[in-house]
């Protein structure tokens, strides 16, 4: 139960969390315009990773979008890479974990192919989550750093008489969107992982005891009720009564000292 | 078409109060600010104010030392400016105007005259 | 506040001539978010409200005559009629739309010589 939970709860942070990576690239609002310097500014400059947009104080708002691939910035193209990145893994990540899920029923899946498949699709949220909080803090670092940089030539102008205010830049809300996603992201990925190592059983050292009496065969695997917590793929935790030497549900016997015949 | 009406001349005592109406018809007057700008006789134009009506965002020239008052009535789609504290140099066409694209004023009401005289 | 000087005060000018009013603004109007300049020209004739003329410091309003241009970026300013006509009879406005308070030119009388 407690598996299942962890691994449904997984999934849903996950699903927010990519969403809230797909808004946040689609989001206008990567760097606004500073206004400390210029608080009464009847004309507001955002960007984002696609489009830069101007809202007047009238209430009109133009955005043009960025029409030239090579003429942008290598790291402007980077963080579009690493977002991109970050929601085809997710997506990616979703669609398998949705196979994976213990709740849902897919003809006669094995438990061991859902975990497989848990420990996927979690590796691709982690990773997905990565991208995206590498992605924002790269955009992040580079308003940093061309801030400052403005900053140190605020104002230009003929002998102080006439001011050209340059317009700098600073966090806007996509930033703070990206970066709790890529943390959701990642959380919702680490839950599917520990939910993997629960959906798996572990590997015994002691493999099944044939005990041949007359009439039938009954083998007894020892320690059918085990707890599902190592990564191994048999999740099928019953006692098998199949009057055989090995025991139906073992999917890979490795030769042990400790094996019993 | 576009149209802002001005209610009519005043004429005020130092110290005494004003409040200029301006009806607006023509457009979705909710979705636009509303400007207040006066001209004093033979003088320029001087901003005084706006408001949105839409949710009564105001913003005020400070030279008017919270003097003025920008109100609007949605239902009756009408702006106005109020003025208090009266003084002689108030004496000006007081002018309604529409915010445009480019941050400009494409119509105007027709002006209202306040004379402040004791 | 930004301050808008306009020059010169007044300004005659024979019919079908060219009359230039220039426009100084003590900060610079130019939006480096869409390379636009926020300065408005208006014109005014006696006993009306100012008209629209040009916004965007070149974009003409509607209805406005294409003998009305608008020139100029950053500080300096021109607005230019290439053939006064007897209705350019007005003064002429120049208004700072990029910082409140919005602040205008104190104006230029165009007169027929």
């Known amino acids: 139960m407690a598996v299942t939970a962890c691994q449904g709860l997984g999934f849903v942070v996950s699903l927010i969390g990519i969403a809230g990576i797909i808004a946040a690239t689609c989001m206008d609002q990567w760097s606004t315009q500073d206004l400390y310097n210029n608080p009464v500014t009847a004309v507001f400059n955002y960007q984002g990773l696609w489009r830069s947009c101007v809202r007047e104080s009238s209430g009109f708002t133009e955005c043009r979008g960025y029409f030239t691939l090579l003429g942008l910035p290598a790291m402007l193209q980077a963080v579009r890479a690493l977002m991109i990145v970050g929601i085809v893994l997710g997506a990616i990540g979703l669609l398998v974990s949705i196979f994976a899920l213990k709740c849902i029923r897919i003809g006669s899946m094995e438990d061991s192919a859902k975990a497989n498949m848990t420990l996927t699709s979690g590796i691709m949220f982690i990773v997905s989550g990565l991208c995206a909080i590498a992605g924002v803090s790269v955009f992040a670092n580079m308003l940093v750093t061309n801030f400052w940089m403005s900053t140190a030539n605020m104002y230009t102008g003929m002998g102080g008489m006439v001011q050209t205010v340059q317009t700098r830049y600073t966090f806007g809300a996509a930033l703070f969107v990206g970066w709790v996603a890529g943390g959701l992201t990642l959380i919702g990925g680490v839950m599917m992982c520990i939910a993997c190592r629960g959906l798996a059983p572990e590997e015994t050292n002691y493999k099944a005891v044939s005990y041949h009496a007359s009439g039938h065969s009954v083998a007894y695997k020892p320690g059918g009720f085990k707890a599902s917590t190592g990564f191994g793929s048999n999740t099928k935790n019953k006692k098998i009564y199949d009057g055989g030497a090995r025991t139906e549900d073992e999917v890979q016997s490795y030769p042990s000292k400790h094996d019993y015949v | 078409q576009v149209q802002l009406v001005q209610s009519g001349a005043e004429v005020k005592k130092p110290g005494a109060s004003v409040k200029v109406s301006c009806k607006a018809s023509?457009?979705?007057?909710?979705?636009?600010?509303m400007n207040w700008v006066r001209q004093a006789p033979g003088q320029g134009l001087e901003w005084i104010g706006q408001?949105?009506?839409?949710?009564?965002?105001?913003k005020y020239n400070g030279n008017f030392k919270g003097r003025v008052t920008i109100t609007a009535d949605t239902s009756a789609s009408t702006a106005y400016m109020e003025l208090s504290s009266l003084r002689s140099e108030d004496t000006a066409v007081y002018f309604c105007a529409r915010y445009y694209r480019g941050n400009c004023f494409d119509y105007w009401g027709q002006g209202t005259l306040v004379t402040v005289s004791s | 506040d930004i301050v808008m000087t306009q020059s010169p005060d007044s300004l005659a000018v024979s019919l079908g001539e060219r009359a230039t009013i220039n426009c100084k603004s003590s900060q610079s109007l130019l939006n480096s978010g869409n390379q636009k300049n926020y300065l408005t020209w208006y014109q005014q004739k006696p006993g009306q409200p100012p008209k629209l003329l040009i916004y965007?410091?070149?974009t003409r309003d509607s209805g406005v005559p294409d003998r009305f241009s608008g020139s100029g970026s950053g500080t300096d300013f021109t607005l230019t009629i290439s053939s006064l006509q007897a209705e350019d009879v007005a003064v002429y406005y120049c208004q700072n739309a990029y910082t409140y308070p919005l602040t205008f030119g104190g104006g230029t009388k165009v007169e027929i010589k």
């Open positions: 023509g457009y979705a007057f909710s979705n636009y600010w």
């Open positions: 965007w410091a070149s």
């Open positions: 408001i949105y009506p839409g949710n009564g965002d105001t």
